[in-house]
């Protein structure tokens, strides 16, 4: 059956009879109506991916390199199935490229120039491609040939395989810059060698090579990595401070129509019957005929790529940056030291209006990009199509978990002057009823459920990591009869209550009228029995603050909090009767863009902040109505962070541990990409 | 209610300029943000360039150097001078104002510019 085959691309003759031999061995152990191989022969990676694209093949494993070429227009491949390496209860998917140094020496990531490098080999990833591909626009000019800007940039280096007739500066540290193990200073531990006979200064390896060649931790302890916001941290902390992570080797299929399951479905199959040790007669990973054919001889079996993660993403900004340097050989115009507009993520068509305005009225130093959710944003951010956005704590979790960093924090209660430098402790998460009915915290189940948004923080994260401690499952839609929680599956219970419209039904972005802490509140007017929403959220919508036609005669008296001891307490009385607190909404950023996007914003505060008092004829950073775009429109300023830098920090312990065992009821699929 | 008018375009050739207007009523004109915006076949609302209420301007990237934003606060009206148009200029064009504070759906008809030989 055609659309059960999966048609694998070979790159050889070799290739090409493992391939055979694959699709024999599978057709043995497979029913007859599962997934079949079939193979098709090309003379090359990139024909392989332009076969694919072309729909001529649908599979083939690339290096990480090649997935760049496999990503790019007109090929638009995705990765759908990664090899993973050591043990399956610790599958090890990418390396990390790093910067190694002695401890006793004191520059950074921007102080290279004039110092001693040493490198795994010319065109490598770790030792040359990712190094240099990022400090590619620190490169004196002309940067072409490459390998002479290089030798111009470092004072001497060891670069095996470069042309050291041509360019004896690469090979100043290595002699004849020798092509295999007969250079000491060949490949990843011949570069680490470089460094530790003290005859570079620094060496681009991968982040195992320390750990491989010096097995005493002491030892190890002689050494930092170089951070690429110019700190320094130790070896073991290669996670946080590395200069790409680098994904291993990657089954590539079609963006649409690419069979991802079918091909998950094959392989899993495949490593089950024909994976390491399994099997004496056809192994997947070795053969006979070669070395890594189809697939790595190193690899312990497959892992699939979740399918939120394309290829950016799995790529990852840092390794796409350097590998489009180097490619396309352009930098900006301006220095790099030089904060170029930050691009805001707006959601959806009225924060884009809003962010609009704000982009005229900054005079351009702020531009604005559009997506529909806010797990979209993230994702541009992440990319580098987007900088900034201000996200509620359950998203600043998310975000954290994808390599974000929070730059300044949302405060609501501290008066100008001292607001910029104040860290608020938060707001109260509340669980909102009508004064007329009779309901408690311990009566919910059955009732209708208003919440801002799946994975927000008082819509969302409080109330239902207390549900779920209760009833230990996460059918929260069985819970509640019905209800309105933005983001949930579009045939929920959970959706039920939402009003669209239409196509925007049940969507987590201002387009879904019962959206956000506005609209979750206007839910409970509206349709529902409980409403759970920051604690300011009655105030600021009723009494005629809110002119809106469902709201303008709203009374505070007619909503009360629900209190965990099943009492209820006046809204007035959040401090007494709340279900938690909850971090104050934070603006996130990639780290290497976190210091201008706070220069700028400290700066767009001052003139468009809550010193603005007429918000009718001039721009208002902090006002929206009640709709809450870009900001909460109760944002008095934006401050710093000082030492709560990361997300762990900010949002503290007992948030992070809630969100973290709410985790096993996620939904958010970015969140399983990022953590993959 | 607020009201916005936009006229003046039509079928020029490449290189060739147009002028567009946007007669606005019930808005307090004097004191908002104006923005001109466009939409092109199949393509999402695009912001082409802005004027803030002390006639700071913006344009985006594409158009800086051939288009002028203005205002004429004593008529109400916002204008658009496009010169050395080229066929991606293509569009319906749309003024707004973001006087509300709501980021409404106050949008004129349009006027649709065509740019082809």
């Known amino acids: 059956v055609p659309e059960k085959s999966v048609r694998w691309c070979a790159v050889s003759e070799h290739e090409a009879t493992k391939c055979q031999s694959f699709r024999d061995h599978m057709k043995s152990v497979l029913p007859s109506n599962g997934p079949s191989v079939a193979c098709v022969k090309k003379a090359s990676h990139l024909d392989c991916i332009r076969a694919i694209a072309a729909n001529e093949a649908d599979a083939v494993t690339l290096d990480a390199g090649l997935v760049y070429d496999a990503y790019l227009a007109p090929n638009n491949l995705k990765p759908v199935v990664a090899e993973f390496y050591g043990s399956k209860e610790d599958p090890q998917t990418f390396y990390y490229a790093v910067a190694v140094v002695k401890k006793d020496s004191d520059f950074q990531m921007n102080q290279l120039r004039g110092r001693k490098s040493c490198h795994t080999g010319l065109g490598r990833s770790a030792g040359w491609n990712i190094p240099i591909g990022l400090l590619y626009c620190d490169l004196p000019e002309p940067r072409k040939p490459l390998e002479k800007a290089v030798a111009n940039f470092f004072s001497g280096s060891c670069v095996p395989c470069a042309d050291g007739t041509d360019f004896p500066q690469l090979c100043q540290l290595c002699p004849g810059c020798g092509c295999s193990t007969l250079n000491q200073y060949f490949s990843y531990s011949g570069a680490f060698k470089c460094l530790k006979d003290g005859a570079g200064d620094v060496a681009f390896v991968k982040h195992s090579t320390i750990f491989e060649n010096l097995a005493n931790k002491a030892d190890r302890d002689q050494y930092e990595l170089l951070c690429l916001d110019n700190t320094r941290k130790s070896v073991d902390e290669y996670k946080d401070c590395h200069l790409a992570r680098v994904p291993s080797h990657t089954v590539v299929a079609r963006s649409v129509g690419g069979k991802e399951d079918l091909i998950w479905e094959l392989l899993n199959q495949a490593q089950e019957h024909f994976g390491k040790d399994k099997s004496k007669e056809f192994q997947l990973f070795s053969s006979p005929h070669g070395k890594d054919l189809l697939f790595k001889d190193s690899a312990h079996g497959f892992l699939k790529v979740p399918p939120r993660m394309d290829a950016k993403m799995y790529l990852g900004y840092e390794y796409i940056t350097a590998i489009r340097n180097l490619r396309e050989g352009t930098c900006p115009e301006a220095p790099t030291d030089e904060c170029k507009p930050v691009k805001w993520c707006a959601l959806s068509h009225h924060e884009r209006l809003k962010c609009d305005e704000w982009s005229v009225n900054s005079a351009g130093k702020i531009e604005c990009e559009s997506a529909e959710t806010t797990e979209d944003c993230i994702a541009k951010i992440m990319n580098g199509e987007a900088d900034a956005m201000s996200l509620d704590g359950g998203f600043v979790y998310i975000a954290g978990m994808c390599g974000l960093v929070p730059v300044l924090a949302e405060n609501y209660n501290t008066p100008n002057p001292n607001c910029e430098n104040t860290a608020e402790e938060g707001y109260f998460a509340v669980a909102v009823v009508k004064s007329s009915s009779d309901l408690t915290w311990d009566n919910l189940k059955g009732k209708k459920s208003c919440h801002t948004a799946v994975g927000r923080t008082a819509g969302w994260n409080i109330p239902m990591g207390l549900l779920y401690s209760k009833i230990n499952h996460c059918r929260f839609d069985e819970f509640f009869s019905e209800g309105c929680a933005p983001g949930s599956e579009k045939n929920s219970s959970l959706c039920k209550l939402c009003m669209g419209p239409s196509p925007n039904l049940c969507e987590p972005n201002n387009k879904e009228g019962y959206y956000g802490y506005t609209g979750a509140f206007r839910c409970l007017v509206e349709k529902g029995d409980v409403a759970f929403v920051k604690h300011q959220t009655v105030p600021q919508n009723t009494g005629g603050k809110n002119p809106d036609a469902w709201a303008k005669n709203l009374k505070e008296e007619d909503y009360e909090l629900l209190c965990l001891d099943g009492s209820r307490k006046s809204v007035q009385e959040p401090a007494n009767c709340h279900l938690a607190r909850a971090p104050n909404h934070a603006v996130v950023a990639r780290k290497d863009k976190a210091d201008c996007v706070q220069t700028l914003l400290l700066d767009q505060q001052r003139m468009f902040g809550s010193s603005v008092t007429d918000c009718s004829s001039n721009f208002c950073l902090f006002e929206s109505k009640t709709k809450d775009l870009l900001f909460r429109d109760d944002t008095v300023c934006l401050a710093k962070l000082h030492d709560r830098n990361t997300y762990e920090k900010y949002l503290g312990e007992e948030y992070v541990k809630a969100v973290t065992n709410l985790r096993k009821c996620s939904t958010s699929p970015l969140l399983e990409a990022c953590t993959f | 209610e607020v009201q916005l008018v936009e006229s003046g375009g039509g079928l020029v050739q490449p290189g060739g300029s147009l002028r567009l207007s946007c007669a606005a009523s019930?808005?307090?004109?004097?004191?908002?943000?104006m923005a001109w915006y466009r939409q092109a076949p199949g393509k999402g609302l695009e912001l082409v360039s802005g004027?803030?209420?002390?006639?700071?301007?913006n344009y985006r990237d594409s158009v800086k150097g051939r288009f002028t934003i203005s205002r004429d606060n004593s008529k109400n009206t916002l204008y658009l001078q496009m010169n050395s148009l080229r066929a991606e200029d293509t569009a319906v064009y749309y003024c707004t104002d973001y006087s509300s504070r709501y980021y409404h759906d106050y949008w004129g008809q349009g006027t649709l510019v065509t740019v082809s030989s």
């Open positions: 004027i803030t209420r002390s006639g700071s301007t």
């Open positions: 019930g808005s307090i004109f004097s004191i908002a943000t």
